[in-house]
């Protein structure tokens, strides 16, 4: 029975995807019930994504490699909506790092996951960025600006956003 | 927790060939997206070759592309390099590193996308 099979391949996937994250959230996806898209629970989804805020103090290189041992990477933000998605979830007097960074220190800032870095698809505070010696980006708010993003020393300890592609099981 | 250990390095004329190894032991050898890095004294690291989780797909420098082959073994948890026609400038130390993903053929070229890395093994190349 191709049903049952199914069934059985995705709890063998779930039981081995347990040692990494305890609890997947997952639905079906369109009218198919064949895929299923999950997330870590508590991560939340936005479109193809699943988006984790860690709220530990870390440098830059230690957020990202906190992400990455969860199958993730500091956040690469594509699009206007998807930064508002990532806000609704931030506390207003804190910083996250970005998955940004000018690790030359000559303003070729790079994505971590290597997507073309945009300048028309960037919401930097105006004025920054504004300092060669700071390699790393962060987002935090402003109450003039709102959120945006900005340029910081990349040893300094921040929280951080980690982000996924869903887990289709 | 992942630890890898490399092996199969040594010294070789210009021309001549190697297979690196990358044993894995600890976690589900399976679900990690696994990359060759090499490093110079002096120098960042440098991407040589990546394989996705499923093997699928691979992807190489440009100064290694033709030379150089990346393959694994998900029972024996281990990658393997075979580099061919070895030049003087391929000498360096070369490592092995680990990445979690859930995503069959994705493709990590970057250094700081992996989470675990081995010790290295040094690779001499003389004319």
């Known amino acids: 029975n191709f049903m049952y099979s199914k069934t059985v391949k995705r709890l063998s996937k779930l039981r081995e995807y347990q040692q990494y994250h305890p609890s997947l959230t997952c639905v079906m996806e369109g009218k198919d019930i064949e895929d299923w898209s999950c997330c870590p629970t508590p991560w939340t989804s936005f479109q193809s994504s699943c988006y984790f805020i860690s709220t530990g103090m870390q440098s830059w290189t230690k957020s990202q490699k906190n992400c990455s041992v969860m199958g993730a990477d500091l956040v690469v933000i594509n699009t206007r909506e998807e930064q508002d998605f990532i806000i609704q979830n931030l506390k207003r007097n804190s910083s996250y790092f970005l998955g940004l960074s000018d690790p030359g220190g000559r303003r070729h800032w790079q994505w971590v996951d290597q997507t073309p870095y945009n300048e028309n698809v960037t919401f930097w505070h105006s004025g920054e960025p504004n300092n060669l010696d700071e390699r790393c980006a962060i987002i935090n708010f402003r109450s003039s600006e709102e959120w945006g993003w900005n340029d910081i020393h990349c040893h300094v300890p921040q929280k951080s956003i980690c982000k996924m592609k869903k887990i289709y099981i | 927790q992942v630890q890898l250990q490399e092996s199969g390095g040594g010294s070789v004329q210009a021309g001549g060939s190697l297979r690196l190894s990358c044993a894995a032991s600890?976690?589900?050898?399976?679900?990690?997206?696994m990359g060759w890095f090499r490093q110079t004294p002096g120098k960042e690291r440098e991407f040589v070759a990546t394989i996705s989780v499923s093997g699928s797909s691979t992807d190489y420098a440009d100064s290694v592309k033709g030379r150089f082959t990346i393959s694994r073994d998900n029972a024996k948890k281990t990658v393997y390099l075979q580099i061919n026609s070895l030049k003087t400038e391929d000498t360096a130390v070369y490592y092995c590193?680990?990445?979690?993903?859930?995503?069959?053929?994705?493709?990590?070229?970057?250094?700081?996308?992996?989470?675990?890395w081995g010790q290295g093994t040094q690779v001499t190349v003389s004319s």
């Open positions: 600890g976690r589900t050898f399976s679900n990690y997206a």
């Open positions: 590193a680990a990445r979690l993903s859930f995503d069959n053929t994705a493709l990590y070229t970057s250094a700081n996308r992996y989470s675990y």
